[in-house]
Amino acid sequence: MKVLQEPTCVSDYMSISTCEWKMNGPTNCSTELRLLYQLVFLLSEAHTCIPENNGGAGCVCHLLMDDVVSADNYTLDLWAGQQLLWKGSFKPSEHVKPRAPGNLTVHTNVSDTLLLTWSNPYPPDNYLYNHLTYAVNIWSENDPADFRIYNVTYLEPSLRIAASTLKSGISYRARVRAWAQCYNTTWSEWSPSTKWHNSYREPFEQH
């Protein structure tokens, strides 16, 4: 039994780091393998992650980390019974993938303005809480070419756009994702999408 693709890990910088790897053949990850992880610190103790299958030869492990700070560094040991298959390390702050925003809501009752709001996925005491920026994706269900991205570079989890920038009388969907420049993170997954029917009063044309 050998590791074909070494584990790569990303952290949500809150409570979970996810590591994925591939074995050289079909593997029952949960019965055959264990991933041990330990904070590099005098008083820390080793924790065990039981991996799950992720395709035939792929494995994934969700490492529980109830707290993360920028200095944290973990040792990782992948075991098959008594055999050490791979040894490595992982610094969560250098491999951050933020949590996806949630509770995306489209408020259509504000004059002819669309107000999109969502929730910051982090609690106020988490470092990323005040460092997230967002991308909002709006697209038409009727017209695949009607697809747009709005970059929200301020901290407030909301976006206002004129309803007239979208076509009237058709349905749109929106979703939002997040990233943090401070840790040069990857983008989060997209939030679940929300749907609304766009309608607004066309301005009266005078001739």
Epitope: L39, F41, L42, L43, S44, E45, D66, D67
Partner: antibody, heavy 122, light 107 residues
Framework: EVQLVESGGGLVQPGGSLRLSCAAS????????MHWVRQAPGKGLEWVSY????????YYADTVKGRFTISRDNAKNSLYLQMNSLRAEDTAVYYC???????????????WGQGTLVTVSS | DIQMTQSPSSLSASVGDRVTITCRAS??????LNWYQQKPGKAPKLLIY???RLHSGVPSRFSGSGSGTDFTLTISSLQPEDIATYYC?????????FGQGTKLEIK
């Protein structure tokens, strides 16, 4: 409610031995690392020894290394400190304290016992 | 060994005063700095861990700050029950060392 109760202290002659115990209750003892910390009369706190939850890691202060032995029995929810070759300067109140193994607590000594007094004198 | 030096060794303040105690480490200890409160004849109690995190049940008038070698414990509005000796402690390197303590009294 978390409780740590030390016992075994008393008067002992220089060169003698004593075994301190710390009985734990109100939490899952086997999940926590444990320390011994002492305080000489009228003085400050001095760390003595540490043992990890599964006894795999043990540390001692240089002042007690080779004379003191820390151990634990998770089945009995108990921590011990075997003290040999005692000296007058070992006279102190001895406290047991736990640390959480969860990273969020960052390994501080979050609960302490009330202490047991060890007096080394002839 | 890392030396932990607290200042002042003792201080007298009035109820309602803002009180600051400092702790200096002889070398970088990251943020692994804890503060304990000990009342006469009692065991120490954890106040603040990892420089600035408040232990559960500790009043919000206590706060901590700093990093590296210089750390501060602040009591925003001194209360009569805060009369005690305060100790800082580093757990970044062996042996784990405490400051000599700061005895806080009411004027």
């Amino acid at each position: 409610e978390v409780q740590l109760v030390e016992s075994g202290g008393g008067l002992v002659q220089p060169g003698g031995s004593l075994r301190l115990s710390c009985a734990a209750s109100g939490f899952t003892f086997s999940d926590y690392g444990m320390h011994w910390v002492r305080q000489a009369p009228g003085k400050g706190l001095e760390w003595v020894s540490y043992i990890s939850s599964g006894s795999t890691t043990i540390y001692y202060a240089d002042t007690v290394k080779g004379r003191f032995t820390i151990s634990r029995d998770n089945a009995k929810n108990s921590l011990y400190l075997q003290m040999n070759s005692l000296r007058a300067e070992d006279t102190a109140v001895y406290y047991c304290a736990r640390i959480s193994t969860v990273v969020a607590k960052r390994y501080a000594m979050d609960y302490w016992g009330q202490g047991t007094l060890v007096t080394v004198s002839s | 060994d890392i030396q932990m030096t607290q200042s002042p060794s003792s201080l007298s303040a009035s109820v309602g005063d803002r009180v600051t105690i400092t702790c200096r480490a002889s070398q970088d200890i990251s943020n692994y700095l804890n503060w304990y409160q000990q009342k006469p004849g009692k065991a120490p109690k954890l106040l603040i861990y990892y420089t600035s995190r408040l232990h559960s049940g500790v009043p919000s008038r206590f706060s901590g700050s700093g990093s590296g070698t210089d750390f501060t414990l602040t009591i925003s509005s001194l209360q009569p029950e805060d009369i005690a000796t305060y100790y800082c402690q580093q757990i970044n390197a062996l042996p784990f060392t405490f400051g000599q303590g700061t005895k806080l009294e009411i004027k």
